[in-house]
């Protein structure tokens, strides 16, 4: 019968001829009366056999990631008779893995959006690298993820590539972050190969800013001839949030005279001071009112950022108008 052990050849061997093992018949008494032959894909070009001894050699550099096993056939012939000594047999040469492939991130570019002020531990995104080396061969394809850039705001789980928030972030201070993740094979041991990827993390807005008046004092004037409903001026607050989180409503906080009103121009986000009651210079030539501004909609969990509404003081001067003489006879 045939005698052999399992055949392995390491990939990427630089030698011109690498001994793999020996095929032999147990009838071979070593007197060179038998001839060994190799058949099948790779016979003669990738692998050769010593016809006398049955020793097999690899004569080409092999790449496991291209082809991981070769199925060949062996024959042994009695030189004197030309007959087969053993039935033709199939055998396998396995190409064993070396760590010659670095981890690669295949789903680039990575981009994620996460709400600002999210708590620590919030999941942002998972990045995944793949390694073409043999996962069943040692640690060649066992990956470990680490953060090269992004501390202290982000962390990455070493075995899963899951990126989480590790410190609260405020969109109004920085609205996007570039995080760089490294994947190392050999579970990070010496001789490991690595690959990196960049992740763009954008912060979406939450309503963590209240509107604040640009000025703490406004001076406006109104003619005593102005009819009710007249717009006598505008006031303006700033809100550094965006979209609906910056929509605001202006209102009167104090107006003892009940002479003025404020309406909100939702297009411009300005407050328009309106005359509610006619004024008379001779009766009262100036007024002081206080306006306040609030966001249109604030979720309950964000009320802590909106505890006291911003106010502004508005001084309104009444302009005298010459009135036609009202003298009696």
């Amino acid at each position: 019968g045939w005698v052999w052990n399992q055949f392995f050849v390491p990939e990427e061997m630089n030698t011109t001829s690498h001994h793999i093992g020996q095929l032999r018949s147990d009838l071979d008494n070593g007197n060179n009366s038998f001839q060994y032959k190799l058949l099948g894909a790779g016979a003669g070009s990738t692998f050769i056999i010593d016809e006398r001894t049955g020793d097999i050699y690899a004569i080409q550099k092999l790449d496991r990631e291209e082809r991981s096993l070769y199925i060949l056939r062996a024959q042994v012939i009695d030189i004197a008779t030309g007959r087969a000594v053993e039935p033709e047999s199939e055998f396998v040469i396995k190409v064993s893995d070396i760590n010659d492939n670095e981890p690669k991130f295949l789903d680039e570019p990575y981009e994620a959006i996460v709400p600002e002020m999210s708590p620590e531990g919030t999941l942002v995104i998972q990045v995944t690298a793949s390694d073409a080396d043999d996962p069943s061969s040692g640690n060649n394809a066992r990956l470990l993820y680490s953060l090269l850039q992004g501390q202290p705001y982000f962390s990455v789980e070493p075995t899963t590539g899951v990126i989480r928030i590790s410190s609260k972030m405020d969109r109004e201070l920085q609205d996007e972050y570039w995080v760089i993740i490294q994947a190392k094979d050999m579970i990070g041991q010496p001789g490991a190969l690595s690959g990196t990827t960049s992740v763009l993390i954008k912060l979406s807005d939450v309503n963590d800013n209240k509107p604040i008046f640009k000025e703490s004092l406004y001076r406006l004037t109104v003619s005593e001839s102005a009819p009710t409903g007249t717009s006598i001026g505008t006031i303006m607050a700033y809100d550094n949030d965006i979209g609906e989180n910056a929509e605001m409503d202006y209102s009167i906080e104090e107006d003892d005279s009940q002479t003025f009103d404020i309406i909100t121009n939702h297009e411009t986000q300005e407050g328009i001071v309106i005359l509610k009651k006619k004024v008379d210079f001779e009766h009262q030539n100036h007024y002081g009112i206080r306006a306040k501004v609030k966001n249109h909609h604030v979720p309950e969990q964000l009320m802590k950022y909106h505890t006291e509404a911003s106010t502004t003081f508005i001084k309104i001067q009444v302009e005298d108008v010459d009135e036609p003489g009202g003298g009696g006879s």
Partner: antibody, heavy 125, light 107 residues
Framework: QVQLVESGGGVVQPGGSLRLSCAAS????????IHWVRQAPGKGLEWVAV????????YYADSVKGRFTISRDNSKNTLYLQMNSLRAEDSAVYYC??????????????????WGQGTTVTVSS | SYELTQPPSVSVSPGQTASITCSGD??????VSWYQQKPGQSPILVIY???KWPSGIPERFSGSNSGNTATLTISGTQAMDEADYYC?????????FGGGTKLTVLS
Amino acid sequence: QVQLVESGGGVVQPGGSLRLSCAASGFTFSRYGIHWVRQAPGKGLEWVAVIWYDGSNKYYADSVKGRFTISRDNSKNTLYLQMNSLRAEDSAVYYCARRAGIPGTTGYYYGMDVWGQGTTVTVSS
Amino acid sequence: SYELTQPPSVSVSPGQTASITCSGDRLGEKYVSWYQQKPGQSPILVIYQDNKWPSGIPERFSGSNSGNTATLTISGTQAMDEADYYCQAWDSSTVVFGGGTKLTVLS
């Protein structure tokens, strides 16, 4: 790393002039407003001036209005403070400080998150 | 012009809670920042927008702001917290600092 470095301080006579510089590195200078803040010996912090990220707006403390001019050169990553008609009460350590907040945000709600080491100005005859 | 008033000094025993106040007209309507300054050093931002922490500032520091008073609270005060503390607010396009409070950690 993120850094602001002031220079240009020195001793000057009352009525004289001085130009302070503040060199920025480690961040995108053109995205941030910058303040000048001063501190007289043994005293507290006093705000001097601010310039917006693009130079479009400048505001000054009443105590320096008309005498000091804040400016910036974004191509050189440098902020300036031109100080004219100097008085004894202008003697102080002058700091430049970065206004926290991205472009498009208004106001000074977010504080000054990066400060230089300061440069000393002494106005004395 | 707008003014912010702070007590000149506050003392606290190690491990105790220190509270530094800052008062100004309708201050609760504004946003307040707090700075720490140690002798010979530049100021450091420790709280912004009333109650938010800049990166790297321990959560022993906290802030609140209501009515006419903002408060910086330092819990579990340590010797390294001994410094001058300044509040800062914004009014009509200008920046205003409080006069500063010297925090002494008793030994």
